[in-house]
């Protein structure tokens, strides 16, 4: 019977007695970066092309023995996972591999950099169609190896790599860390965070996604028809390369971001169970497993858009923190979370000809987040209308005036320190969705787009009596593209978008009164966009 | 283009040896093994074992009964199939083919094995 | 050892006939199955691989279906230079086995 891996990825309609998907991505080259391998084991023969690349570090111990089988093993398993004929994910992929682990599993940061190199190269030499990059592997934190990373994606070259296997945030890893590669966590069967005896997955807002990642049966390089089960980030990783394959082969125009948003978007939402996170990675932690999309393709008429959290911004008293979204995503809101709720807004504003979203933490605060809505718009003209403190007892409000530009997120951020303190909430009059409003005090941010056939509404959701947490969802059809709080509820901690939900958290609710200050209203903003339906149409 | 090329017909008595090669070329060595596979006159085809040009690891056929020696010379890209205490019933035509998908084949070497 | 059985053993056909050549396993061996052409005095030549996926080079009159333990090699229309024995071939599992061959020829 099929695997549990392979099912938990596979959506209801692929799903049979066997796992055969439409397609096992025949266009597309996957790289794997890792130990040596089998290449001519029955599960993977013809399929992996190992190129004369070998930098790897002598093995540790006077007495370490070289058993090829041992040597072999990861790269082997991992190579099955991607594209075993039986046991794989992409079975039409074809792989090379690059040889950066020794032995022991161990690598080095140049070896792993000129392996990056060597890719480089070779894809000027000799380009074929989408690549793939697998980095099954995880080390300190790497400026030097970030870079890298971000200079080959940005050569149009899918990086997907492993969490790391040490129960820790991803962020503090290489290549984990970097913003342009494709991290993944692992989940096991039941669809919690894989413990790996006293340790476990990363996770953190460096996470991406998760996949299979605990009891997945591949290649075993014991013999040339073995198969055996291994756990951890990498056969995670090798999953998600692998569905990155089969995606790029059913649309090989797809672009990084493109590819990065639809992976999320058909995801299995909600499935963790978060308790096992650190209580202050949680909120941090995609809630997302991986799977294939039902069909590969007809997805191009959905505006697609992503949560991205800075990292935290640190105690001091003008602290910011700040979130960009990747160059070909559009920012199109803003929004700001603090534990303590001690913050001072968050705007947006241009840094380098591109907006990005920044946090302001507040005297005696903790420390704050910036949480960028970042999506994908094509064509978009999005500019930032701001309207300074109003003074004035209505409130300060900003709105999209230019002709054809729509609403997509309203920020706001103050200078005072105890902004909204006793004072009553300022409420949105009726009739006017088209604008942000706030606190006399505050200044208020709109984000106004004008992409083809975008077209936004707001929805809210209100409480009166004091609550840990509010939220609103936008309909099906519609993406949730801003995400705030109406002013006036002094207890709020921030808001944030998990998929298509808005969420607005406030202080624990029994410090908080049930006065009208216990209120709190959660805004979403709601957009679609009819030309991408449009143009979907005409190509089917 | 992919290639497998065979030794030369080989006429034995009963209780030689013989030792068939196949030199290949035209693909990466490592990414297949060779599949060894016979078929006796007028007869179908035999799966004799599989031999990996990577490590040298070998997989065989129960039927061999420990008389069978398959290995690999990388340097000339050559594998081998040694056969020993020959018997009548041995005479065939033995292929070797890429793999265990077997997609490429030899053109064949006939072992006559006559008194 | 899976077992793999052909039938029908030989069939007589002519020119432009439809042919259909079926193959039973002795227990499931997903889609690792192969058909091959094989000519007198000629090494097999890999017809389908996977079960249903032709090589490059492969006529398109020549094709393969099944799954599990049933497969079936099909030939749309019978051309002259198809006369021939065929056979089907699993790999699932060593040792990798044939079935006994399907001899096609001219009515």
């Known amino acids: 019977s099929i695997p549990w891996n392979l099912e938990r990825i596979t959506p209801p309609r692929y799903r049979a007695d066997e796992y055969q998907p439409p397609d096992g991505g025949s266009l597309v080259e996957v790289y794997l970066l890792d130990t040596s391998i089998q290449s001519d084991h029955r599960e993977i023969e013809g399929r992996v092309m190992v190129t004369d690349f070998e930098n790897v570090p002598e093995e540790d111990g006077t007495r370490f023995h070289r058993q090829a089988s041992k040597c072999d093993s990861h790269g082997t398993h991992l190579a099955g996972v991607v594209s075993g004929r039986d046991a794989g994910v992409a079975k039409g992929a074809s792989m090379r591999s690059l040889r950066v682990l020794n032995c022991q599993g161990k690598g080095t940061v140049s070896g792993t950099l000129i392996g990056l190199e060597f890719i480089r190269k070779s894809q000027l030499v000799q380009p074929v169609g989408p690549l793939v990059v697998l980095l099954p592997l995880a080390g300190g934190y790497s400026r030097v190896l970030n870079a890298a990373c971000q200079r080959l994606a940005r050569a149009g070259v899918v990086l997907v790599t492993a969490a790391g296997n040490f129960r820790d945030d991803a962020c503090l890893y290489s290549p984990a860390s970097a913003p342009e590669v494709i991290t993944v966590g692992a989940t096991n069967a039941q669809d919690q965070p894989v413990t790996l005896g006293t340790l476990g997955t990363n996770f953190g807002r460096c996470v991406d996604l998760f996949a299979p990642g605990e009891d997945i049966i591949g290649a075993s390089s014991d013999c040339s028809t073995c198969f055996v089960s291994q756990s951890g980030t990498s056969q995670a990783a090798a999953h998600v390369a692998g569905i990155a394959a089969m995606m790029l082969s059913a649309e090989p125009e797809l672009t990084l971001a493109e590819l990065r948003q639809r992976l999320i978007h058909f995801s299995a939402k909600d499935v963790i169970n978060e308790a096992w996170f650190p209580e202050d990675q949680r909120v941090l932690t995609p809630n997302l497993v991986a799977a294939l999309p039902p069909s590969t393709h007809g997805a191009g008429w959905q505006l697609f858009c992503r949560t991205v959290w800075s990292a935290h911004s640190g105690p001091t008293r003008m602290a910011t923190a700040v979130a960009r979204c990747a160059p070909d995503e559009e920012l199109l809101s803003c929004s700001s979370f603090s534990r303590s709720g001690k913050r001072r807004g968050e705007r947006m504003e241009a840094q380098g000809g591109k907006l990005v979203c920044r946090a302001h933490n507040a005297f005696g605060g903790e420390g704050v987040y910036a949480i960028a809505r970042c999506c994908l718009l094509p064509q978009a003209n999005c500019s930032v209308h701001t309207a300074p403190p109003a003074e004035a007892s209505m409130g300060t409000r900003v709105h999209c005036h230019q002709q054809g530009h729509v609403l997509t997120g309203c920020s706001s951020h103050w200078e005072v320190e105890d902004l909204g303190t006793h004072k009553p909430p300022v409420l949105r009059p009726r009739g006017q969705p088209n604008q942000c409003v706030g606190h006399r005090e505050a200044s208020i941010h709109a984000s106004c787009c004008h992409a083809p056939g975008l077209e936004c509404k707001v929805k809210e959701h209100g409480i009166p009596a004091p609550q840990e947490q509010v939220t609103v969802a936008c309909e099906e059809g519609w993406t949730l593209t801003g995400c705030s709080a109406l002013p006036g509820t002094s207890h709020v901690l921030g808001a944030y978008a998990v998929d298509n939900t808005c969420v607005v958290r406030s202080r624990d609710v029994s410090t908080t009164g049930s006065t009208s200050e216990g209120a709190v209203t959660a805004v979403a903003i709601c957009c679609r966009s009819r030309h991408l339906a449009q143009a979907s149409q005409e190509l089917q | 283009q992919v290639q497998l090329v065979q030794s030369g017909a080989e006429v034995k008595k009963p209780g030689a040896s013989v030792k068939v090669s196949c030199k290949a070329s035209?693909?990466?060595?490592?990414?297949?093994?060779i599949s060894w596979v016979r078929q006796a006159p007028g007869q179908g085809l035999e799966w004799m074992g599989w031999?990996?040009?990577?490590?040298?690891?070998?997989n065989y056929a129960q039927k061999l009964q420990g008389r069978g020696t398959m290995t690999t010379d990388p340097s000339t890209s050559t594998a081998y199939m040694e056969l020993r205490s020959l018997r009548s019933d041995d005479t065939a035509v033995y292929y070797c083919a890429r793999g265990f998908g077997m997609d490429r084949w030899g053109q064949g070497t006939t072992v006559t094995v006559s008194s | 050892d899976i077992q793999m059985t052909q039938s029908p053993s030989s069939l007589s056909a002519s020119v432009g006939d439809r042919v259909t050549i079926t193959c039973r396993a002795s227990?499931?061996?997903?889609?690792?199955l192969n058909w091959y052409q094989q000519k007198p005095g000629k090494a097999p030549k890999l017809l389908i691989y996977?079960?249903?996926t032709r090589p490059t080079g492969v006529p398109s009159r020549f094709s393969g279906s099944g799954s599990g333990t049933d497969f079936t090699l099909t030939i749309s229309s019978l051309q002259p230079e198809d006369f021939a024995t065929y056979y089907c071939q699993q790999w699932d599992d060593t040792p990798n086995t044939f079935g006994q061959g399907t001899k096609v020829e001219i009515k």
């Open positions: 996977g079960a249903s």
């Open positions: 227990q499931n061996i997903n889609n690792w």
């Open positions: 035209g693909y990466s060595l490592t990414s297949y093994g």
């Open positions: 031999v990996s040009f990577y490590n040298g690891q070998t």
